[in-house]
């Protein structure tokens, strides 16, 4: 394994980070922030990448489906938590192709730095990010709940994952920002459910000494749809795009899928219809089962030990911050817009610390900060009691969940002895079956002077596709050492965030 | 390897819409990569006009946001390109092509098809 | 939008010959400078990707350098074959090309 020049490995960096955003389910995109190191291995005709990304949250659902790079800047009337992360990715691509690269695993750790950057000392507005956000379930159930009324096509829709809450304290009242998942539960159940997934971001406002907040003076919800199902035409014709259908009083993807179709088989979408989806293809077949079979290329991953999974991580306080990792078929989005104007014209960047009371627990007694060397952790646990979890991604959610036996996957890897197998609040321990590609870990708050703790490089060994020896792993272990000519440049416009990471300025 | 091949009509009257159809063999494109629309003026001069990911998500040229769309029928492994309200201006031989990641670099081309705008 | 330069529009050299042909952006463009041929009949092809590297399929007597905002696509020894428009486009932000630079047998 050989060091090599951060900036000669952008694009395989920007590919990579695309690819481990398309394996995740819930959370935000990763944008890329700097190549912090890399090194590369030279195995017959295939190039092994072992790449350390610094990354930042952005504030697009990774639902969206969206390249990190096109996620527009957030809405400035609304707190943008700054969540930091680093990623370890073990990468291929054949040598000669250019459009060719694969993600083998990656490992991420983020951290919120929102209350390390705040400067609260002149501010009239006081703005907190709750790391416990299920406590702000009620809140979203009751946006939710809200949008139902104005949007029948959301009838069936749950409140999934409760992703990130602000509140805001100034002169004119107090508002908590609320952006959660939601997932399609339709009562009738079909040998599949259709796999829809949304996005809302709730902004529910009550008066300075409110404590009731069970009733909010004022409520703005947004939701977007991302549908697994296709949202195209017929005849390749395009509608018209003067004249956008509507339906239900807000605009929609103009076309869809008839509802329960066999395959193939496409009407145009009628405006007025009510709005129902098929349900999607088995988990690993990404579309291809319309039409006739292509020649594929590579996959963006390579196929995982199960075919739908999900990482859960677990606090001791029983919240869960899990990441999906399932590699399923396309998601489309249709934005649905709420008629209600945002009430208060306060500006609230002004920082903010964070409830500390909050904080998830560290389960083994040493402090979450300490630098690990490395990147591994005391114990040979996951940093701060995350660990992986797998099971059928489309039968988990709000939704009732299946059966235990009904898992389609994975094999033998437990959590380590002793730890819990806690799903969330309500749910019964459910087996761990296998050893999932890639993870991401949220880890608590950063404070000022505190760096993020690398994510562990302890990958299992891989055999390499198409390789001669394919009993023979051929990924090295993770280098410890930094690239020469590493870390690259930070990307214009994150210059507040690059204290928290290590090796923070050029060689 | 991937091949693109270009389809529509060469002839468009000025104020309607044009469409293209670019059909895509050798390669799915639900699997990887961004497919692209771009055109060549009269005289040579290349314009970037938007792509569709493999993901389904969409990014345009900012100068034809208003007019542009780009969509896709993965059944028939097939990208469209809407234009509305087109002119004279138009004009132009369009190519689809395909780019690893964006617009980064287009690896493969389509042959590209003429469309004249004339009344 | 970052514009991109081809200063010479039209070159003549002999068969054989080493051919440079240099492409100026107006900003950094940290190594997104590719570069394309485009034949008489329209075919276009990617040479060259990210600066310096060869597309799979492509001669190496074809290379690429540069850096910042100056770019170069060397032709070691000229071909008949290699007569065509070559075209450099940047690709770190939205996608400009240059005005192309037509190569012809003197």
């Known amino acids: 394994v050989s060091p090599t020049d951060c900036s000669a490995v952008e694009p395989e960096a920007e590919k990579a980070l695309d690819l481990i955003n398309k394996r995740r389910r819930d959370g935000y995109l990763f944008q890329l922030l700097r190549i912090a190191d890399a090194h590369l291995d030279r195995v017959e005709n295939t190039t092994v990448y072992y790449l350390v990304l610094d990354v930042q949250e952005s504030d697009c659902s990774v639902l969206s489906r969206k390249y990190w790079n096109d996620c527009e800047p957030p809405d400035s009337r609304r707190p943008s938590e700054i969540v930091i992360g680093q990623c370890k990715v073990i990468a291929t691509r054949h040598s000669h192709e250019s459009q060719d690269l694969r993600v083998i695993d990656f490992n991420c750790t983020t951290s919120s730095v929102s209350s390390a950057l705040a400067n609260t000392k002149d501010s009239p507005v006081l703005i907190d990010f709750f790391e416990d956000t299920e406590r702000y379930r009620k809140q979203a159930n009751k946006a939710l709940e809200k949008y139902k009324e104005e949007n029948d096509d959301f009838a069936s829709f749950r409140v999934d994952r409760i992703e990130r809450v602000a509140r805001v304290r100034g002169g004119e009242g107090t508002g908590y920002f609320v952006d959660f998942s939601v997932r399609n539960c339709p009562r009738h159940h079909f040998p599949r459910h259709p796999n829809v997934f949304g996005f809302c971001r709730a902004d529910l406002f009550y008066d300075v000494e409110a404590l009731d907040l069970e009733s909010p003076k004022n409520l703005v919800i947004n939701c977007e749809v991302f549908d697994p199902q296709e949202h195209e035409n017929i005849n390749g014709v395009p509608p018209h795009l003067g004249h956008p259908f509507h339906w239900g009083g807000h605009e929609r993807s103009s076309t869809t899928k008839p509802p329960f179709k066999p395959h193939g088989s496409r009407d145009h979408h009628h405006p007025h219809k009510p709005h129902e989806h098929g349900p999607p293809p088995p988990p690993d077949e990404r579309d291809h089962s319309h039409g006739p079979p292509l020649p594929q290329g590579p996959p963006p991953l390579l196929p995982m030990s199960c075919s739908s999974c999900q990482h859960a991580t677990f606090g001791t306080n029983g919240a869960q911050r899990h990441s999906h990792n399932n590699n399923s078929s396309d998601l489309h989005p249709h934005k649905h817009h709420s008629h209600e104007q945002h009430p208060h014209g306060h500006h609230p960047h002004a920082h903010h610390p964070h409830e500390h009371d909050t904080h998830r627990q560290h389960p083994h007694g040493h402090h979450p900060h300490g630098h690990h060397p490395h990147g591994h952790h005391p114990h040979g646990h996951h940093p701060h009691g995350h660990h992986p979890h797998c099971h059928d991604f489309q039968d988990y959610g709000p939704c009732d969940p299946p059966p235990h036996n009904q898992g389609h996957c994975c094999h033998g890897h437990g959590p380590p002895p002793g730890h819990l197998r806690r799903r969330g609040p309500g749910k019964g321990p459910r087996p761990f079956h296998c050893r999932q590609i890639g993870s991401v870990y949220r880890l608590p708050p950063l404070r000022k002077g505190e760096v993020l703790p690398l994510p562990e490089a302890n990958f299992p060994s891989f055999p390499l596709p198409h390789h001669k020896h394919p009993l023979k792993p051929d990924n090295q272990p993770f280098p410890q050492s930094v690239s020469e000519s590493c870390p690259g440049k930070f990307k214009s416009g994150f210059p507040q965030v690059s204290m928290f990471f290590t090796h923070t300025f050029p060689k | 390897e991937v091949q693109l091949q270009e389809s529509g009509p060469g002839l468009v009257k000025p104020s309607q819409s044009l469409s293209l159809t670019c059909t895509v063999t050798g390669y799915s494109i639900t699997s990887d990569y961004a497919w692209n629309w771009i055109r060549q003026f009269p005289g040579n001069k290349l314009e970037w006009m938007g792509y569709i990911s493999y993901s389904g998500s969409t990014n345009y040229n900012p100068s034809l946001r208003s007019r542009i769309s780009i969509t896709r029928d993965t059944s028939k492994n097939q990208f469209f390109l809407q234009l509305i309200s087109v002119t004279t201006e138009d004009t132009a031989t369009y190519y689809c092509?395909?780019?690893?990641?964006?617009?980064?670099?287009?690896?493969?081309w389509g042959q590209g098809t003429l469309v004249t705008v004339s009344a | 939008d970052i514009q991109v330069t081809q200063t010479t529009s039209s070159l003549s050299a002999s068969l054989g010959d080493r051919v440079t042909i240099s492409c100026r952006a107006s900003q950094d463009i940290s190594n997104y400078l590719n570069w394309y041929q485009q034949k008489p009949d329209g075919t276009v092809k990617l040479l060259i990707y990210y600066t310096s590297r060869l597309h799979s399929g492509v001669p190496s007597r074809f290379s690429g350098s540069g850096s910042g905002t100056d770019y170069s696509l060397t032709i070691s020894n000229l071909e008949q074959e290699d007569i065509a428009t070559y075209f450099c486009q940047q690709g770190n932000t939205l996608p400009t090309f240059g005005g192309g630079t037509k190569l012809e047998i003197k």
């Open positions: 092509g395909s780019a690893s990641y964006r617009y980064a670099w287009f690896a493969y």
